[in-house]
C-alpha cells in the first residue's frame, strides 16, 4: 500500500523526493515471475545467484545449479532443458535492437555436474532454445538455423542462405522485430518437438538507413540497417517447416500463403502450433485492415503442409486497422480445431470470441462497454483472461476466470477484491494445466507478487512484497495521485493528475503535461511509480497530468480508430482540450504550462507547442517523429495508409512538425535526440532543427552521441538533469 499520510506534527521528519533518488533508482520495485517447469515446480534465481527448484506441494526447495557454476562462465541467464538433463548458460550479452541480442552459450550437464565438451556452440549466437520435449537444441548463428539432437552432438545445418542484412532465417529483421513479432526469434517448435517452423526474411530490396557511430576511433563507423520507411519496399517473408527427427529426409517445406493475401504485398504476423501436425499461421495485407488466420495440416503421404481454404478465417476492420496494436493470436482448445480469440464485437469493443467453424458463427464469450485484454490460459474447464471491466476504470487490469465446462459459463473475478486499494493492475503467470498461478500486482500501491492455487484461487504465499521499498518510502513525501475523467463532446478523456504533497486547491501551480498518445497506447494506468514526474510534484511543486485522448486503447473502437489515417490531429486536440479543462479547475497557473513527451509523445508535444493556442509556455520533445514519411512502414501504414497521391500523401505532408516551424516562435522548445537512434532516426530531429533555423526561430537542443531511442546509462542522468533545469527555468523556480 502507499504509505498513509502522516499528521502535520510529524511532517517535518519527512522529506521530498530528490532527483538523485530517481536517477539512483532508490525507489524501484521488484516483481516475481516463477520460471515454471511443471504443474507444481518452478525455478528461481536466488539473491545469491543459485538456481533453485521450488516444489509448491512439498514446500521444499533445492539448488540444481550453484552460483559457483554460474560465475565460472559469467552467466547472466539460464534455461533448463525439458528433460531436465541440461541447462544452457548465457553470457557475453550484447544488445542489438529492442528485443534482439547475441550471447555466448555453454551447456551444463546436471547429471554429471560438468560442462558438455566437444561440439561446442559457435559464438556469438543470435538465438538459442530447447525443444519443448527432450533436449534438442535449435539455434541461429550468422543468420542461419542449426539443429542439435543432443547438446554434445555435431550440429545439422538447416538453412544455408543466411546473410547479414540480406537474408534472416529464424530471427526477424529490424522491422519485423520492432513492429510485428515483438520478439528476438522467428522460429517455433511444435508441441512435442517433431517439427520446427521458421521464418525467412529477405531484405535484399529494402532501402538502408545509415548513420554514424562515433565510438573512440579516428573515423566513425557507419551503421547500416535495412529499414523500410512508409511506402518503401518491404521484406519478403516465407515460412518453412522441417521435420527435426529426419531433417535431411525431405528438408524444409514451405507453408503456402492464402491466395487472398498473396495477391498483393503482405506480412506474416504470427505462428501458433496446435498439435505436432497442425499449425496456425496469421497473415496480414500490407494495407492492414484484413487479416487471415490459416490452419494447416501435415500431409504424411506428401510430407507437405496443406492449408485448405475451409480453414481460413478472415478478420476485417471497416473502421480502422485489424486488431489493436497487433492482431490478436488464437488460443486453441483441447479439440485442436476451435479456438478463443479477442476481436471487436458489433458494438466496437474488443472481446473474447469462440470460433468453431467460421468467424461469422463465432460465439461471443465476454461483452460490455469495456475490453478483454489478454487470454492467459485455456484449460479443460476454465478460461483465464484479463480485462478493465471492474468499476469501469479503463486503466485497471483484473484477472477473471470463466468456467467453460458448464452452461451457461459462469464468470468470477479472481483479483478484484484481493487487495482492493493496493492492487488494481494485475498480470498473471500460469503453471502447466493452470494447477497454480502467480499474480503480479503493479499498483497503484507498492507492487506485490503472490502464489495461488489454480483450483480454489486461494493465496498460498507471498513471493515478493517489496518490504524494503515500503520502509524506504516511510519518510518520503510522495505526491498524491488521482485518476478521473472529463466528458467533452461525447468523448471521455481519462486523466491521471499527480499533485504536490501539500496540495491546496486555493493556490496556483505550474502544470506539466506528460504525453505519449500513440495509437493503441494507454498512459492513464493504476500502477505504482516513483519516477521523474513524482519528483517534480514532490520537490518542485508542479502538477503533472497524463491524458488518454482519441487513438488510445481499451475503451472501444470509436476512440481507438478516431485517429485512423489522421495521425497528429485529434491526439493533439485532446491534450489541448484537457489543459483548458484543468485551467477551469482553478489551481493551475495558466502562465506556467508545459508539455513533454518521448517518441510518439515527442511528436505530440511538438505539435501541441506549435498549435498556436498560446496555452504552453514551453515544452520538450525527446526523440520525436517529425514526419510519418521517416518512420517504419509496418507501424506507420497501419494507421496512415500509404504516402501516395491516390492514398494518403496529403495528410502525410500536412502532419509534419516542420510544416509548423513558424508557430514555435512564441514558445521555449527543447529538442533532444540520440544520434544512434535505430528506431526514430536522428533525421527526424535534424529536419525539425533545419526547419526552425530556416524560419529563424530560436530553440534549445541536446543530442546524445551514440545513444539509441532509450537514451540509457549516463545519458539518462544527463537527460533528466537537463530537462529539470529547462522546466525550472521555464516555470521560474529557483535552482
Amino acid at each position: 500500500l502507499r504509505p498513509s499520510r502522516v499528521h502535520n506534527s510529524e511532517e517535518n521528519t519527512m522529506r521530498a523526493l530528490t532527483l538523485k533518488d530517481i536517477l539512483n533508482g532508490t525507489f524501484s520495485y521488484k516483481t516475481f515471475f516463477p520460471n515454471w517447469i511443471s504443474g507444481q515446480e518452478y525455478l528461481h534465481q536466488s539473491a545469491d545467484n543459485n538456481i533453485v527448484l521450488y516444489n509448491i506441494e512439498t514446500g521444499q526447495s533445492y539448488t540444481i545449479l550453484s552460483n559457483r557454476t554460474m560465475k565460472s562462465v559469467n552467466a547472466s541467464n539460464y534455461g533448463l532443458s525439458p528433460d531436465r538433463q541440461f541447462v544452457y548458460l548465457e553470457s557475453d550479452y550484447s544488445k542489438l535492437w529492442r528485443y534482439s541480442y547475441t550471447a555466448t552459450y555453454y551447456i551444463y550437464d546436471l547429471s554429471n555436474g560438468e560442462f558438455v565438451r566437444g561440439n561446442e556452440l559457435p559464438r556469438p549466437i543470435q538465438y538459442l532454445c530447447w525443444s519443448p520435449v527432450g533436449s534438442k537444441l535449435a539455434y541461429v548463428y550468422q543468420n542461419n538455423i542449426y539443429l542439435k539432437q543432443r547438446p554434445g552432438d555435431p550440429p545439422f545445418q538447416i538453412t544455408f542462405n543466411g546473410r547479414e542484412n540480406k537474408i534472416f532465417n529464424g530471427i526477424p529483421d529490424w522491422v519485423y522485430e520492432e513492429e510485428m513479432l515483438a520478439t528476438k526469434y522467428a522460429l517455433w517448435w511444435s508441441p512435442n518437438g517433431k517439427f520446427l517452423a521458421y521464418a525467412e526474411f529477405n531484405d535484399t530490396d529494402i532501402p538502408v538507413i545509415a548513420y554514424s557511430y562515433y565510438g573512440d576511433e579516428q573515423y566513425p563507423r557507419t551503421i547500416n540497417i535495412p529499414y523500410p520507411k512508409a511506402g518503401a519496399k518491404n521484406p519478403v517473408v516465407r515460412i518453412f517447416i522441417i521435420d527435426t527427427t529426419y531433417p535431411a529426409y525431405v528438408g524444409p517445406q514451405e507453408v503456402p500463403v492464402p491466395a487472398m493475401i498473396a495477391s498483393s504485398d503482405y506480412y506474416f504476423s504470427w505462428l501458433t502450433w496446435v498439435t505436432d501436425e497442425r499449425v496456425c499461421l496469421q497473415w496480414l495485407k500490407r494495407v492492414q485492415n484484413v487479416s487471415v488466420l490459416s490452419i494447416c495440416d501435415f500431409r504424411e503421404d506428401w510430407q507437405t503442409w496443406d492449408c485448405p481454404k475451409t480453414q481460413e478465417h478472415i478478420e476485417e476492420s471497416r473502421t480502422g486497422w485489424a486488431g489493436g496494436f497487433f492482431v490478436s493470436t488464437p488460443v486453441f482448445s483441447y479439440d485442436a480445431i476451435s479456438y478463443y480469440k479477442i476481436f471487436s464485437d458489433k458494438d466496437g469493443y474488443k472481446h473474447i470470441h469462440y470460433i468453431k467453424d467460421t468467424v461469422e458463427n463465432a460465439i461471443q464469450i465476454t461483452s460490455g462497454k469495456w475490453e478483454a485484454i489478454n487470454i492467459f490460459r485455456v484449460t479443460q474447464d476454465s478460461l483465464f483472461y484479463s480485462s478493465n471491466e471492474f468499476e469501469e476504470y479503463p486503466g485497471r487490469r483484473n484477472i477473471y476466470r470463466i468456467s467453460i465446462g458448464s452452461y451457461p459459463p459462469s464468470k468470477k473475478c479472481v483479483t478484484c477484491h484481493l487487495r482492493k486499494e493496493r492492487c488494481q493492475y494485475y498480470t498473471a503467470s500460469f503453471s502447466d494445466y493452470a494447477k497454480y498461478y502467480a499474480l503480479v500486482c503493479y499498483g497503484p500501491g507498492i507492487p506485490i507478487s503472490t502464489l495461488h492455487d489454480g483450483r480454489t484461487d486461494q493465496e498460498i504465499k507471498i513471493l515478493e512484497e517489496n518490504k524494503e521499498l515500503e520502509n524506504a518510502l516511510k519518510n518520503i513525501q510522495l505526491p498524491k495521485e488521482e485518476i478521473k475523467k472529463l466528458e467533452v463532446d461525447e468523448i471521455t478523456l481519462w486523466y491521471k493528475m499527480i499533485l504536490p504533497p501539500q496540495f491546496d486547491r486555493s493556490k496556483k501551480y505550474p502544470l506539466l503535461i506528460q504525453v505519449y498518445g500513440g495509437p493503441c497506447s494507454q498512459s492513464v494506468r493504476s500502477v505504482f511509480a516513483v519516477n521523474w514526474i513524482s519528483y517534480l510534484a514532490s520537490k518542485e511543486g508542479m502538477v503533472i497530468a497524463l491524458v488518454d485522448g482519441r487513438g488510445t486503447a481499451f475503451q472501444g473502437d470509436k476512440l481507438l480508430y478516431a485517429v485512423y489515417r489522421k495521425l497528429g490531429v485529434y491526439e493533439v486536440e485532446d491534450q489541448i482540450t484537457a489543459v483548458r479543462k484543468f485551467i477551469e479547475m482553478g489551481f493551475i497557473d495558466e502562465k506556467r504550462i508545459a508539455i513533454w513527451g518521448w517518441s510518439y509523445g515527442g511528436y505530440v508535444s511538438s505539435l501541441a507547442l506549435a498549435s498556436g493556442t498560446g496555452l504552453f509556455k514551453c515544452g520538450i520533445a525527446v526523440a520525436p517523429v517529425s514526419s510519418w514519411e521517416y518512420y517504419a512502414s509496418v507501424y506507420t501504414e497501419r494507421f496512415m495508409g500509404l504516402p501516395t497521391k491516390d492514398d494518403n500523401l496529403e495528410h502525410y505532408k500536412n502532419s509534419t512538425v516542420m510544416a509548423r516551424a513558424e508557430y514555435f516562435r512564441n514558445v521555449d522548445y527543447l529538442l533532444i535526440h540520440g544520434t544512434a537512434d535505430d528506431n526514430v532516426h536522428f533525421q527526424n530531429s535534424a529536419q525539425i532543427a533545419k526547419a526552425l533555423v530556416n524560419a529563424q526561430v530560436d530553440f534549445q537542443a541536446m543530442w546524445y552521441s551514440d545513444q539509441n531511442h532509450g537514451l540509457s546509462g549516463l545519458s539518462t542522468n544527463h537527460l533528466y538533469t537537463h530537462m529539470t533545469h529547462f522546466l525550472k527555468q521555464c516555470f521560474s523556480l529557483s535552482d
Epitope: 511443471s38 504443474g39 516444489n55 506441494e57 512439498t58 539448488t63 540444481i64 533448463l80 546436471l110 555436474g113
Partner: nanobody
Framework: QVQLQESGGGLVQAGGSLRLSCAVS????????MGWYRQAPGKRRELVAG???????TYADAVKGRFTISRDNAKNTLYLQMNSLKPEDTAVYYC?????????WGQGTQVTVSS
C-alpha cells in the same frame, strides 16, 4: 537431510530382467519429480528415466519400450523395471531427484549385463 538407497542390481544375461528399488527418506517421493540415472564405465552419467510428481514420464531413447519407472507412495520407494536388457545397459544406476541437486548423489547399484 535427503537419503537415497538404491538396490536390486546384479549380474544378468542379455535379454533378462531386473527391478531396481530406491528407498527415499527426507522427502516424500510421490510429491517430487524423481529420476533414475546411470553411469557406464568411462562414460558420463545420463538420465535413464524421469517421473514427474504427477504422471508425466521421460525415457532416454535407448531404453524406451524396455524400461518402466514407477513408485510406491506408501513405501516412499522408486522403482525401475528393466526388461530385455542389453550389454550396453551395464552401468552403475542411481536414483535422485529430477533434475538432480547439484551436490548430492547416493552410492548407486551396479547392473552388469553379460552377452
Amino acid at each position: 537431510q535427503v537419503q537415497l538407497q538404491e538396490s536390486g542390481g546384479g549380474l544378468v544375461q542379455a535379454g533378462g530382467s531386473l527391478r531396481l528399488s530406491c528407498a527415499v527418506s527426507g522427502i516424500i517421493s510421490s510429491m517430487n519429480a524423481m529420476g533414475w540415472y546411470r553411469q557406464a564405465p568411462g562414460k558420463r552419467r545420463e538420465l535413464v528415466a524421469g517421473l514427474g510428481s504427477g504422471v508425466s514420464t521421460t525415457y532416454a531413447d535407448a531404453v524406451k519400450g524396455r524400461f518402466t519407472i514407477s513408485r510406491d507412495n506408501a513405501k516412499n520407494t522408486l522403482y525401475l523395471q528393466m526388461n530385455s536388457l542389453k550389454p550396453e545397459d551395464t552401468a552403475v544406476y542411481y536414483c535422485n531427484r529430477w533434475p538432480p541437486p547439484y551436490d548430492y548423489w547416493g552410492q548407486g547399484t551396479q547392473v552388469t549385463v553379460s552377452s
